[in-house]
């Protein structure tokens, strides 16, 4: 696994990323695991980065990702009691200059090196399904979420609100 030292070199509260020329309002480091407590890890293979979902050994250190939170500049279309808040989108970066990307054509989640401003494929709408779980919905493809398939991350279509609690799109964030 890689990325721990790389991320810690840029744990500044704010750094220059943008959706529409704006900076993230908040950033922090966290490890990412599945609903079933498998860890999301990142490895360099053949000059490209691979993402794995795996059980770690007892004392093995978890990879961290830098979560950057952005306020949507568009007003929410949803009715209800939350419309006065701005929708939050996140980017996830396990090491400097690399971000998780949604590849909608291949239904895959990939790590891409890219320059700022980041493309829309790097942004995910954040959902809270359970008290300690989050889900990541593709900004570029509403209804499609980051999920777990065959020990890899993949894009999974969620057809109805009942399926938002499907375990394979639920993730835990941990700072330890």
């Amino acid at each position: 696994a890689f990325g721990i030292s790389g991320v810690q070199k840029y744990t500044r509260a704010l750094h220059d990323s943008s959706i529409t020329g704006i900076s993230p309002i908040t950033e922090y480091l966290a490890s990412l695991s599945t609903y079933n407590d498998q860890s999301i890890t990142f490895a360099l293979e053949d000059e490209s980065y691979e993402i794995y979902v795996e059980d770690l050994k007892k004392d093995e250190k978890k990879d961290k990702v830098l979560l950057s939170y952005y306020e949507s500049q568009h007003p929410s279309n949803e009715s209800g009691d939350g419309v006065d808040g701005k929708m939050l989108m996140v980017t996830l970066s396990p090491t400097k200059d690399f971000w998780l990307h949604a590849n909608n054509k291949e239904h895959s989640v990939e790590l891409h090196k890219c320059e700022k401003p980041l493309p829309d494929q790097a942004f995910f709408v954040l959902h809270n399904m359970h008290s300690n779980c989050v889900s990541f919905e593709c900004k570029t493809d509403p209804g499609v979420f980051i999920g777990v398939k065959d020990n890899h991350l993949a894009l999974i279509k969620v057809d109805s609100s009942e399926n938002l609690c499907t375990e394979n799109i639920l993730f835990k964030l941990s700072e330890t």
Epitope: T26, A30, E78, G80, G82, K86, M87, N128, L173, E175
Partner: nanobody, 121 residues
């Protein structure tokens, strides 16, 4: 709707201390993080400190070692203990929370009205 109410601002001498509080209320399902931003006269808003639901924290370089952020999950309240205050800490301090409500799973960003902190002799 989620409301954030800040308190604890005021006038303090350089080297002094203040404790800010921010209470979140409304139909809150979950809170992902709560934090403090500040805006000095004529400047943009900047992050001061954030604490996540898991207890992780992040601080602006300018306040590390002087400010401490904490939260009480049972009350959906966040605190900012500010020590060794300097004139350059003078600003309006805003509470910010990322939360979802019972009407939607989408996490949204909510802001308080702000509380003024003035550091002056």
């Amino acid at each position: 709707q989620v409301q954030l109410v800040e308190s604890g601002g005021g006038l303090v001498q350089p080297g002094g201390s203040l404790r800010l509080s921010c209470a979140a209320s409304g139909s809150i399902r979950t809170v992902n993080y709560m934090g403090w931003h500040r805006q000095a006269p004529g400047k943009g808003r900047e992050l001061v400190a954030v604490v996540t639901s898991g207890g992780g924290t992040n601080y602006a370089d300018s306040v590390k070692g002087r400010f401490t952020i904490s939260r009480d999950d049972t009350k959906n309240t966040v605190y900012l203990q500010m020590n060794s205050l300097r004139a350059e800490d003078t600003a309006v301090y805003y509470c910010n929370a990322a939360a979802s409500t019972y009407s939607s799973t989408v996490v949204r960003s909510f802001w308080g009205q702000g509380t003024l902190v003035t550091v002056s002799s």
